[in-house]
């Protein structure tokens, strides 16, 4: 099964890699384009089914986009000697549906990883931490780009997709140095509550174009370095006091809230009051009520508490059939 293979050791891979001849420092794999001056290798739109074994040691930027990799096994980039310079790895749109534990091990300089536009039915909890220890060696990753990695419904495992991604982000507290995390366009219905607590260095968090209905159980409190929080194009109805206070307490943050179906009833009063005095929301005058119909298109900033009412809920004895 996926989970069994994900926890298998990468030692056999390393042994076979070690027995092979070390790559020549200036050779370029078949179906790739290489520039030693730019420290860049591009193997793009070549229908590759596995990561080339003979990558040049100088590679700093590796593009493996638009391929058909399917599975990224443990030690997929482990080489002898290691690819010690590799800093940016782009695997977007390569039809990956499985990323196993330890897939990015032995890349000591890897700062940026882009797995976007891959339908990840299985993402190992140890994909980024490399081990199942409760506290792993810190990952060198600074930027992790995971936009549109949700698989189609028929390829989803029974467990929640949100939970699977969260497990990979928090495993071993390996991503404590992460500055940028993009999780846009993943149909997230919620954000698991413990995720952000394990990512204290975040400066940029993109959760746009998901289906987040509420942030009630999400805590931003410890994200003291956060500069940009993208929540556009979700299903947010209102932000409650706890969330508002946490956002206001972040010293550098800019929050983007466009294109959410704000419900302008009595529960919106606190958010309207906050919007009128806060400087953290970008383009706040573009926020408009979506519901109820009588309030549709009203600008939130122009509302008064008298505008925000809730229809009284009649006790059963007063309800008409």
């Amino acid at each position: 099964t996926s989970s069994a293979s994900s926890s298998s050791s990468s030692a056999p891979f390393l042994a076979s890699a070690a027995s092979a001849q070390p790559p020549l420092p200036d050779q370029c794999p078949a179906l790739c384009e290489c520039s030693e001056a730019a420290r860049t290798v591009k193997c793009v739109n070549r229908n590759l089914t596995e990561v080339p074994t003979d990558l040049p040691l100088y590679v700093r930027n590796l593009f493996l986009t638009g391929n058909q990799l399917a599975v990224l096994p443990a030690g997929a980039f482990a080489r002898r000697p290691p690819l010690a310079e590799l800093a940016a790895l782009n695997l977007s749109g390569s039809r990956l549906d499985e990323v196993r534990g330890g897939a990015f091990e032995h890349l000591p300089s890897l700062r940026q990883l882009d797995l976007s536009h891959n339908p990840l039915a299985y993402l190992s909890p140890f994909a980024f931490s490399g081990s199942n220890a409760s506290i792993s060696a810190p990952s060198p990753l600074v930027e992790l780009i995971l936009n549109h990695i949700v698989p189609p419904d028929d390829k989803r495992q029974n467990r929640s997709f949100e939970g699977m991604v969260a497990a990979a982000l928090v495993a071993g507290r390996a991503l404590q140095g992460l500055h940028l995390l993009e999780l846009a366009s993943n149909h997230f219905l919620y954000l698991p509550r413990d995720v952000l607590a394990q990512l204290p260095s975040l400066r940029y968090l993109d959760l746009s174009n998901n289906s987040l209905v509420s942030l009630t159980y999400v805590s931003f409190r410890n994200l003291t370095h956060l500069e940009s929080l993208h929540l556009e194009d979700n299903a947010l109805k209102v932000l409650h006091n706890g969330t508002l206070a946490e956002l206001q307490g972040l010293p550098h943050v800019r929050v983007f809230l466009d294109n959410n179906p704000w419900v302008c009833d009595c529960h919106m009063a606190d958010m309207v009051t906050w919007l009128k005095q806060t400087g953290v929301v970008q383009g706040k005058d573009r926020l408009t009520c979506a519901f109820p119909e009588k309030m549709r298109n009203r600008v939130l900033l122009e509302l008064n508490s008298a505008d925000l009412d809730c229809d009284p809920i009649l006790p059963p004895s007063l309800q008409t059939s």
Epitope: N259, T288, N297, L301, E302, L303
Partner: antibody, heavy 116, light 107 residues
Framework: QVQLQQSGAELMKPGASVKLSCKAT????????IEWIKQRPGHGLEWIGE????????DYNEKFKGKATFTADTSSNTAYMQLSSLTTEDSAIYYC?????????WGQGTLVTVSA | DIQMTQTTSSLSASLGDRVTISCSAS??????LNWYQQKPDGTVKLLIY???SLHSGVPSRFSGSGSGTDYSLTISNLEPEDIATYYC?????????FGGGTKLEIK
């Protein structure tokens, strides 16, 4: 009830500028965005941009930046769109509407004809 | 920009017919779609907002449906006053964009 009353037809020379008006009644003018729409025969409807009257905030379709300029006068509940450096491509009917998630109420349109 | 396509530019139907007008977006628009009716005299009215919500005062013979990139407007029982051009419009991403329109005529 909500009404948007637009100014009358204009016949303009190429290179000139024209300022169209849209007077809103029946609602709180500052509480909603006003949108401007262009319609040329055979070109369908095109969104030019929008203005939030009370705050002067504007958004423009990139295609119309430098061509259209929006203003609003809250004392008279009137929104304006100025079109500059007119060419025959600007000949069209221009609508103002109340937005932003949908264009709920529309003015009757102003026909602008640009001809030498 | 998001392109909105109404493949049928005109269609002819008889009074009492059920008529469906389709509209497709160049990318997913999350049900952020409206339908408008423009009468021959130029008057424009909102019919449907957010894919399927009927605007107040609009007859119940009008309905909307769809998801993702594909949407439709249905008139269940065509009346003489429904002769008009119908436009879809997305509000998922600025600039807001319209379909090219479908002109409905009586046979």
């Amino acid at each position: 009830q909500v009404q948007l009353q637009q100014s009358g037809a204009e016949l303009m020379k190429p290179g000139a500028s024209v300022k169209l008006s849209c007077k809103a009644t029946g609602y709180t003018f500052t509480g909603y965005w006003i949108e401007w729409i262009k319609q040329r025969p055979g070109h369908g409807l095109e969104w030019i941009g929008e203005i939030l009257p009370g705050r002067g905030s504007t958004d423009y379709n990139e295609k119309f930046k430098g061509k259209a300029t929006f203003t609003a006068d809250t004392s008279s509940n009137t929104a304006y769109m100025q079109l500059s450096s007119l060419t025959t491509e600007d000949s069209a009917i221009y609508y103002c509407t109340r937005g932003r998630l949908d264009f709920t109420y529309w003015g009757q349109g102003t026909l602008v004809t640009v001809s030498a | 920009d998001i392109q909105m396509t109404q493949t049928t530019s005109s269609l002819s139907a008889s009074l009492g017919d059920r008529v469906t007008i389709s509209c497709s977006a160049s990318q997913g628009i999350r049900n952020y779609l409206n339908w408008y009716q423009q009468k021959p005299d130029g008057t424009v009215k909102l019919l449907i907002y957010y894919t399927s919500s009927l605007h107040s005062g609009v007859p119940s013979r009008f309905s909307g449906s769809g998801s993702g990139t594909d949407y439709s407007l249905t008139i269940s029982n065509l009346e003489p006053e429904d002769i008009a051009t119908y436009y879809c419009q997305q509000y998922s991403k600025v600039p807001w964009t319209f379909g090219g329109g479908t002109k409905l005529e009586i046979k």
